[in-house]
Structure formats: C-alpha cells, structure tokens
C-alpha cells in the first residue's frame, strides 16, 4: 500500500504520500484553532505509471495509454485514498469546544 | 458541476473533464476488443484553486494552503468523480461475448 509506513521510509519517486506540516496561523492564516498549533496534513504526489495502485478501470486504462503514448498529456493523478480525522480545540466566546474534523490527514494514496 | 455538459462547451483552464478518444488497437495495442474500435474515455485536468469542487476537508485545506502559499508544491489534483461503463464485444475462440466494463468513461471531475 502507498501509505505512510512505506512512503515515509523509502525514497519513492512514483505516487506516494508525502509529509506536509501545516501551521494553522502561518500557513492558513487561522487564529481560531487554539490547539494544536499545526498538524501533519500530508499530501499525495508522484507519477502514476501503469499498474501503480490504480483506483478504477479508467485509471488503469489511462496508465496504460500514457505508458504507451508518453507524449500524451492525459495521465492518472496521485490522490488521497485513506484519510483520518484531527481533533482540535477552539473557543466560542470564552467556552472551549473540542471538535473532530473529518478527513484532515492523508494516510495513503492511489492513482485515480 | 465539472461535467461534460459544461466542460466540453467552455474554454475552462481550471479542473474540468477533457475529451480523450482512445483507439483500442492504435493507442492501447489491444486486438482482443472487436467492437467498438475505440471510445471517448476522457480525462480530468486543470488547476484546483480554493473552492473548486473540493472532495474532502483535506482538499479544501490544501487548496487554501496552496492559494496562500503559491510557491508550495502541494496542491489538490483534478480527478474523475462520476464514471460510466462501456459495453464491448469480444471473442472467446469463435464465440462472441458482450461485456460491460465498469468505470471506463469519465463524466465529471473533482479536486481531491
């Protein structure tokens, strides 16, 4: 699987999950999130050659098409597959609130 | 929606579905498909700015991150959303077979 266990341990050029730390204030301009100050959102990148963790028949066909026709601009793209939530602390007035934001952390990628 | 109805009628730079005709023999090297000779598989391409048909909270956050930090390499990618099947005719020996291949035609795209 193109997940953090594999991708973070290997120098992989092809589609894989990459580490990306986002600082809420500096990178997003968010002051409203009290904790954490930031988090590893991660992202997916890298080429999607034929048979590379293809999502659908279309992405497999497109991967084959691109491999056989490398001058073509059409190719599958490396995108998130499994995502996890992030728990944050914020305030409404002076009242602290704990919320779980869904689909915030990329754990693995696929070619779509 | 970033679908064929809109995208094929407009010169759209951002994420949209694009027409792509694939000839089974010439483009894929497939001799086994008897009919059709080819089909419009289509593909998704174009930048994914903030608010552009985002798939998840992560893709919205990443779109915001990329908009505020344009030098960053991390950004959402334009990928298929809705796909349709394709019916093909092929032969097993001299016996004709009709099969519906799922997820072969891209009808719309999203930013993921």
């Amino acid at each position: 699987a193109l997940d953090t266990n594999y991708c973070f341990r290997n120098l992989e050029e092809n589609c894989c999950v990459r580490p990306l730390y986002i600082d809420f204030r500096q990178d997003l301009g968010w002051k409203w999130v009290h904790e954490p100050k930031g988090y590893y959102a991660n992202f997916c990148s890298g080429p999607c050659p034929y048979l590379r963790s293809a999502d659908t028949t279309h992405s497999t066909v497109l991967g084959l098409y691109n491999t056989l026709n490398p001058e073509a601009s059409a190719s599958p793209c490396c995108v998130p597959q499994d995502l996890e939530p992030l728990t944050i602390l914020y305030y409404v007035g002076r009242t602290p609130k704990v919320e779980q934001l869904s689909n915030m952390v990329v754990k693995s990628c696929k070619c779509s | 929606a970033l679908d064929t109805n809109y995208c094929f009628r407009n010169l759209e730079e951002n994420c949209c579905v694009r027409p792509l005709y694939i000839d089974f023999r010439q483009d894929l090297g497939w001799k086994w498909v008897h009919e059709p000779k080819g089909y419009y598989a289509n593909f998704c391409s174009g930048p994914c700015p903030y608010l552009r048909s985002a798939d998840t909270t992560h893709s919205t956050v990443l779109g915001l991150y990329n908009t505020l930090n344009p030098e960053a390499s991390a950004s959402p990618c334009c990928v298929p959303q809705d796909l349709e099947p394709l019916t093909i005719l092929y032969y097993v020996g001299r016996t004709p077979k009709v099969e519906q291949l799922s997820n072969m035609v891209v009808k719309s795209c999203k930013c993921s």
Epitope: R25, L28, G29, W30, K31, W32, I88, Y90, V92, K97, E99, L101, S102 | L51, T57, T60, L64, L68
Partner: nanobody, 118 residues
C-alpha cells in the same frame, strides 16, 4: 444557519471603481474563511479573493493590484474594493463563507451584479 447578503454592485465605466460589501449573520463570523467568487455568463464560478480570520489574503492573478479584500469581525462584514475595473470583470459577485466546524460547509450569498461597460 449563516446568512450572507451582498451589496454595492452596479453599472460602472471601464477604469471606474466599486466597493462590494457582505454582511453575515447567524454564525461565529470571526472563525470563518471569507471569499469573493464571481460568475460570468456561461462560465463556472471562479475565486476572486479570499481572507482568513487571521487576515491572510490572496487574489486571483487577473485582479492583483486592482482589488483589495478586507473584513471586520466585530461588524461581521467583508468588503471588496475594486479599482480600475475592466469589461472582463463583468459578472455576478458572490460572498462565500467557509465554516470548518462541526463539519466543513460553504455558505453562499445571493450575489450582486457588476457590469463594466461604456
């Protein structure tokens, strides 16, 4: 339920100025990411400018140096100062607010028409 109301649109000559305003109600306005989006006839909506609760802003290339986005969290308002307007700026302009909790949701105003013509 967040409600957004835009104002300030109208007809203006090329090179002229307009100031769009957006008033929000029904939400912790200070938390949301605000944006202006526009839609020209037959086109998809496109992001024009955005501003976060921490006052980080960004603009689409075609309006950089001409448009300025600002917000006032105490008054629950956002503005877009548009200078040196061009015919290609003609569109319906929408105020957009993205709230992130409890789940991400985009709220859209009804839009205000901006027409740049001589």
């Amino acid at each position: 339920q967040l409600q957004l109301v835009e104002s300030g649109g109208g007809l203006v000559q090329p090179g002229g100025s307009l100031r769009l305003s957006c008033a929000g109600s029904g939400i912790a306005f200070s938390r949301v990411t605000m944006a202006w989006s526009r839609q020209a006839p037959g086109k998809q909506r496109e992001l024009v400018a955005l501003i976060t609760d921490g006052n980080r802003s960004a603009y689409v290339d075609s309006v950089k140096g001409r448009f300025t986005i600002s917000r006032d969290n105490t008054k629950k308002t956002m503005s877009l100062q548009m200078n040196d307007l061009k015919p290609e700026d003609t569109a319906v302009y929408y105020c957009v607010a993205t709230d992130w909790v409890p789940t991400r949701r985009d709220y859209w105003g009804q839009g205000t028409q901006v027409t740049v013509s001589s």
